[in-house]
Amino acid sequence: VSLRIQEGCSHLPSCCPSKEQEPPEEWLKWSSASVSPPEPLSHTHHAESCRASKDGPLNSRAISPWSYELDRDLNRVPQDLYHARCLCPHCVSLQTGSHMDPLGNSVPLYHNQTVFYRRPCHGEEGTHRRYCLERRLYRVSLACVCVRPRVMA
Amino acid sequence: VSLRIQEGCSHLPSCCPSKEQEPPEEWLKWSSASVSPPEPLSHTHHAESCRASKDGPLNSRAISPWSYELDRDLNRVPQDLYHARCLCPHCVSLQTGSHMDPLGNSVPLYHNQTVFYRRPCHGEEGTHRRYCLERRLYRVSLACVCVRPRVMA
């Protein structure tokens, strides 16, 4: 799925308006990414509990297990993002898969992801049938990681 | 930084050409995202070795430590992506931070990230000063996670 761009539209003050209203399917087809998180969403109960499974997706087998929460904005590309939510404060023991080990912390790994917002073009609200894509950095938690607690010097 | 889009350019067969060649700085300013990985790149030696540090960024404190490898494509948005490369096959012990524990595997977490490629518009190579942004899913490894080995049923 591709979007045709006028060369220079990123900086020239003028671009020609289009002749018709864009059907919603077109924008959403272009803006919607894979609507799945890095790991398939697990609908089994253990994906929401503080334990490390011996099967299933990575987020439920991790000793720092997490669930995924949807973040949806139809005016953003990609429209769906997923945030990792840690299910335990500490890491789960590799031996038992259930008891927490206070020697390890389960912490989210954050990332500033590049996203684009559909916006009215600056200074021409309502005057033209065109829009701008605004590049932004958007903070998402990608996963939860088992780390050794930080020792302050 | 925003890019002006003609409404309808995502699906209409024609869009007006611009009157001038876009300066390279404009595309790069728009396409370049934050050129940093989720965690600051560590230039100390331990970030490249199989051990869990007690300080430094998350990827070096993790018991499934990883390093970041740059993937740069000037015709892609974002132009810089980072791939996580696991530094250990097994998880590092929480007690020692150095010895590996065979009960846990250190595995990459993969994600199909939305990216955009600058392409000549279909069927009009060289005829107009415009280009298309093609949305693609691109596989990146986000981090390395300590998991319990999968038990096959």
């Epitope: 864009e22 924008w27 609507v35 929460e69 916006r119 | -």
Partner: antibody, heavy 125, light 108 residues
Framework: QVTLRESGPALLKPTQTLTLTCTFS??????????LGWIRQPPGKALEWLAH???????HYKPALKSRLTISKDTSKNQVVLTITNVDPVDTATYYC?????????????????WGQGTLVTVSS | EIVLTQSPATLSASPGERVTISCSAS?????MYWYQQKPGQAPRPLIY???NLASGVPARFSGSGSGTDYTLTISSMEPEDFATYYC???????????FGQGTKLEIK
């Protein structure tokens, strides 16, 4: 012309399950970007959003009520159903269904552009 | 969860008067939406995306604001404008719609 109509029981007893149906016409819930939500308003109080369902069957719920709410759609019947389990007198309210999905040149609006007339539900022992 | 606080809760005004209703968000948001509700009726959209008038809404209504502070203004009150007004926002994570507690506009 877009219309929405809510239907459901006027009176329930505490602990019962409330099932509300929104029947709509003039648009399709299978159209990309379209969504339908439920909002309630206790007598003399403010509007409170409860749940939302999108064209692609993605569902959202008010976090504080999530465990009690279920929203579903039947696109062929042009209906959306909301169930609320274990009702209490504080659930007494006028329940509205409303549409969201207006695309402008600048993008989608997250306002509810069409509303039903509402149905009053009383929970009392 | 973002909280919307409207002020004042009640406002008395006379026909012809200029009226301003405020809506404050507990954290920064991109856009605000406004509705009018009359007794026994469903809410009616007034303002889309902070400042765009909904279809059929008279030009005496306007919206403005950014960040955490948003305003609905009625430049010259008409008798039919006496009603309750609500601000509303959409938050993408977690996806939720939130309404303000309402401002009741009464005849002085």
């Amino acid at each position: 012309q877009v219309t929405l109509r809510e239907s459901g029981p006027a009176l329930l007893k505490p602990t019962q399950t409330l099932t509300l149906t929104c029947t709509f016409s003039g648009f399709s819930l299978s159209t990309s970007g379209m969504g339908l939500g439920w909002i309630r308003q206790p007598p003399g109080k403010a509007l409170e959003w409860l749940a939302h369902i999108w064209w692609d069957d993605v569902k959202h719920y008010k976090p504080a009520l999530k465990s009690r709410l279920t929203i579903s759609k039947d696109t062929s019947k042009n209906q959306v159903v909301l169930t609320i389990t274990n009702v209490d007198p504080v659930d007494t309210a006028t329940y509205y269904c409303a549409r969201m999905g207006q695309l402008h040149y600048y993008g989608y609006d997250y306002a509810m552009d069409y509303w039903g007339q509402g149905t009053l539900v009383t929970v009392s022992s | 969860e973002i909280v919307l606080t409207q002020s004042p809760a009640t406002l008395s005004a006379s026909p012809g008067e200029r009226v301003t209703i405020s809506c404050s968000a507990s954290s920064s948001v991109s856009y605000m939406y406004w509705y009018q509700q009359k007794p026994g009726q469903a809410p009616r959209p007034l303002i889309y995306r902070t400042s765009n008038l909904a279809s059929g809404v008279p030009a005496r209504f306007s919206g403005s604001g950014s960040g955490t502070d948003y305003t609905l203004t009625i430049s010259s009150m008409e008798p039919e404008d006496f009603a309750t007004y609500y601000c509303q926002l959409y938050h993408s994570y977690p996806p939720t719609w939130t309404f303000g507690q309402g401002t009741k506009l009464e005849i002085k």
